[in-house]
């Protein structure tokens, strides 16, 4: 069997074949968060479990200090779910009282940091108004998409309010990425 | 063209190259569910269409008796969407009446069963309080993430209430997995 | 190193190996939409950014006239998120007035068009009733799944109401596909 038989007619010579099993991959799961003071319009980053339970990193994809570090340039599928829970939003009361009715909201952002670039890049955002009539509410926001990343890029998940993140179960709040 | 030229410098020798087209894959779609009695705190599993319409299984990924059977160890991306619909939650009425206000909820869980392990493992959970003021409500819960699975593992989708699942369209409620 | 050593025992000879880097891929991001007249029960298609910012198409995956054109048969993962925003639904008022209470809704459909087939195929649908008590609301609908597509198939994203789509940020509303 000649090597040529593995290569479809549109094979680029500069794109070597590689085993799928050695591609950088990570699935991180929620842990209790440290409450943080954060500036207005600057969402705090979540930190993650990277080795216990369902969580793992492999093939040079490393987790450190709230960041997933991209070890190799290429196209990655990146995903996260954050489950939020909270008390009743003041929304309906505000409305009845006739005060300005800006609904509360919950937001998740997957952010890319490139050391050579001064500003972080928001890759994905899920944002939802919360205006519940029940006393306790809970709901997930899910995000996922493909991006071209460079070796050394760092990924993090930011949220609008850390205190509303459900940290209790590894299947409710998670963050992952894999090289395609 | 020598075979060596296909292998990047970090290629592990124990990770053979393989054609993408022969990887285990499945996309299952909703069918009408059989109402089931289930114990408290034990969510019923959905069953699925596996060969008609948009649904398929291929490359030794088989569907049987509500389970997707994993034919080969590796990292899989697993996903599901369940669309729920129902009548008005009692939530707002309960609140007004001053009774304890525990909101209704809808929940989807993707569960892994390993024969050698006594307890199923919850891989992914999407859970949402439902406290609607309109008479009829409907909404999807989407989940997706990557997990390391072993040959022989079984995957299923459990829901909090089968009677609320929208089984009318194959594009509204579905379940899939593919080897990365 | 003989070529045979790259092939696992279940390798099909008709499935050639190919470099991951040359697979068709696209991630499209939102742009301001042109309001369109559309027939009842026929949802308008969104158009997209395909080359600026986070958006790209590569390896013969082309975008033209609201469609992603599939250049090669195979199994694709397809995803989209649409963020909607609007004013208060009339839902609670309708309910109080005792009129028929059909809630407003928001819907996203990922549709496949095959030239040889007269009717488009709905691959994925996310639909949600909207019955908010706050004055302004916003929320995303996310979809993603795997489908077997044929060379020449075209993909588009349809929504129930273009005027409710949040076109302000490329991370809020997007559409992508990649060959597995």
């Amino acid at each position: 069997l000649k090597g040529q038989e593995f290569a479809p007619s549109h094979q680029q010579v500069y794109a070597p074949l590689r085993a799928d099993g050695d591609k950088p991959r990570a699935h991180l799961t929620v842990v209790r968060q440290t409450p943080t003071q954060h500036f207005k319009n600057q969402f705090p980053a979540l930190h993650w479990e990277h080795e216990l339970g369902l969580a793992f990193t492999k093939n040079r994809m490393n987790y450190t200090n709230k960041f997933l570090l991209i070890p190799e340039s290429g196209d990655y599928f990146i995903y996260s779910q954050v489950t939020f829970r909270g008390m009743t939003s003041e929304c309906s009361e505000i409305r009845q009282a006739g005060r300005p009715n800006k609904p509360d909201s919950i937001t998740v952002v997957i952010t890319k940091v490139t050391d050579s670039y001064p500003e972080p890049t928001q890759l994905l955002m899920g944002t939802k108004s919360v205006c519940e009539v029940g006393s306790n509410w809970f709901q997930p926001i899910y995000l996922g998409a493909m991006f071209s990343l460079q070796e050394g890029d760092k990924l993090m998940v930011n949220v609008s309010d850390i205190s509303l993140v459900d940290y209790t179960k590894e299947d409710k709040t998670f963050f992952g990425a894999f090289l395609l | 063209l020598k075979g060596q030229e296909f292998a990047p410098s970090h290629q592990q020798v124990y990770a053979p190259l393989r054609a993408d087209g022969d990887k285990p894959r499945a996309h299952l779609t909703v069918v009408r569910q059989t109402p089931t009695q289930h114990f408290k705190n034990q969510f019923p599993a959905l069953h699925w269409e596996h060969e008609l319409g948009l649904a398929f299984t291929k490359n030794r990924m088989n569907y049987t008796n509500k389970f997707l059977l994993i034919p080969e160890s590796g990292d899989y991306f697993i996903y599901s969407q369940v669309t729920f619909r129902g009548m008005t939650s009692e939530c707002s009425e309960i609140r007004q009446a001053g009774r304890p206000n525990k909101p209704d909820s809808i929940t989807v869980v993707i569960t892994k069963v390993t024969d050698s392990y006594p307890e199923p493992t919850q891989l992914l959970m999407g859970t949402k309080s439902v406290c609607e003021v309109g008479s009829n409500w409907f909404q999807p819960i989407y989940l997706g993430a990557m997990f390391s699975l072993q040959e022989g593992d079984k995957l299923m989708v459990n829901v909090s209430d089968i009677s609320l699942v929208d089984y009318t369209k194959e594009d509204k409620t579905f379940f899939g997995a593919f080897l990365l | 190193l003989k070529g045979q050593e790259f092939a696992p025992s279940h390798q099909q000879v008709y499935a050639p190996l190919r470099a991951d880097g040359d697979k068709p891929r696209a991630h499209l991001t939102v742009v301001r939409q042109t309001p369109t007249q559309h027939f009842k029960n026929q949802f308008p298609a969104l158009h997209w950014e395909h080359e600026l910012g986070l958006a790209f198409t590569k390896n013969r995956m082309n975008y033209t006239n609201k469609f992603l054109l599939i250049p090669e048969s195979g199994d694709y993962f397809i995803y989209s998120q649409v963020t909607f925003r609007g004013m208060t639904s009339e839902c609670s008022e309708i309910r109080q007035a005792g009129r028929p209470n059909k809630p407003d809704s928001i819907t996203v459909v990922i549709t496949k068009v095959t030239d040889s087939y007269p009717e488009p195929t709905q691959l994925l649908m996310g639909t949600k009733s909207v019955c908010e008590v706050g004055s302004n609301w916003f929320q995303p609908i996310y979809l993603g799944a795997m489908f077997s597509l044929q060379e020449g198939d075209k993909l588009m994203v349809n929504v129930s109401d273009i005027s409710l789509v949040d076109y302000t940020k490329e991370d809020k509303t997007f559409f992508g596909a990649f060959l597995l």
């Epitope: 842990v31 409450p35 479990e49 216990l52 339970g53 | 705190n41 919850q122 | -």
Partner: antibody
């Protein structure tokens, strides 16, 4: 309704290792963090540390060098070991469940009195 | 370390009285404050979490308020079963930990 029940030695000599185990009955184990808290006679409450279903731990910095908390998910149990005990470790030891709202402990066991005396 | 100071350390009141116990943190803890009731020989019981949320099953005469550094627990109308020791507890610390106030003993006048 979930219940917690603990057991372990109630009388120790200085320099020995305190060992307690707490079992969770009648509910979910995986969805919570599980803590140990102690209360010396006539004094206030002191949080010792916690563990979750996966085995991730957080400890009170003042006790961290002597504390190990572990989990056995197959039995729905978690355990406390406190090494090199002294008379200052004499206390009622409680196991408790974090409700999911940042160290708000909604279920407690009845407590075990542990005395350290030579 | 964040220090929690409760006041008063003890107080006497009568059935039907309105009682307020305060808790002050040495630095801002946002709303990360819980209140517990403990009776002699018993485990503590959670009353209020996240500063103002009433735990399920706790009578509505108990309420909590405050954010930042100053918090209060109020019992609107004392009942005989309310005589006990009350503890506040913060959960804002970094590294992740929690700490309790020294307690307020509520006695019958």
């Amino acid at each position: 309704q979930e219940q917690l029940q603990q057991w372990g030695a109630g009388l120790l000599k200085p320099s020995e290792t305190l060992s307690l185990t707490c079992a969770v009955y009648g509910g979910s184990f995986s969805g919570y963090y599980w803590s140990w808290i102690r209360q010396p006679p006539g004094k206030g409450l002191e949080w010792i540390g916690e563990i979750n279903h996966s085995g991730r731990t957080n400890y009170n910095p003042s006790l961290k060098s002597r504390v190990t908390i572990s989990v056995d998910t197959s039995k729905n149990q978690f355990s406390l070991k406190l090494s090199s005990v002294t008379a200052a470790d004499t206390a009622v030891y409680y196991c408790a469940r974090d409700s999911g709202w940042h160290f708000s402990f909604d279920i407690w066991d009845q407590g075990t009195m542990v005395t350290v005396s030579s | 370390d964040i220090q929690m100071t409760q006041s008063p350390s003890s107080l006497s009141a009568s059935v039907g009285d309105r009682v307020t116990i305060t808790c002050r943190a040495s630095q801002s803890i946002s709303s990360y404050l819980n209140w517990y009731q403990q009776k002699p020989g018993k485990a503590p019981k959670l009353l209020i979490y996240v500063a103002s949320s009433l735990q399920s099953g706790v009578p509505s005469r108990f309420s909590g308020s405050g954010s930042g550094t100053d918090f209060t627990l109020t019992i609107s109308s004392l009942q005989p079963e309310d005589f006990a020791t009350y503890y506040c507890q913060q959960s804002y610390s970094n590294p992740q930990e929690c700490s309790f106030g020294q307690g307020t003993k509520l006695e019958i006048k």
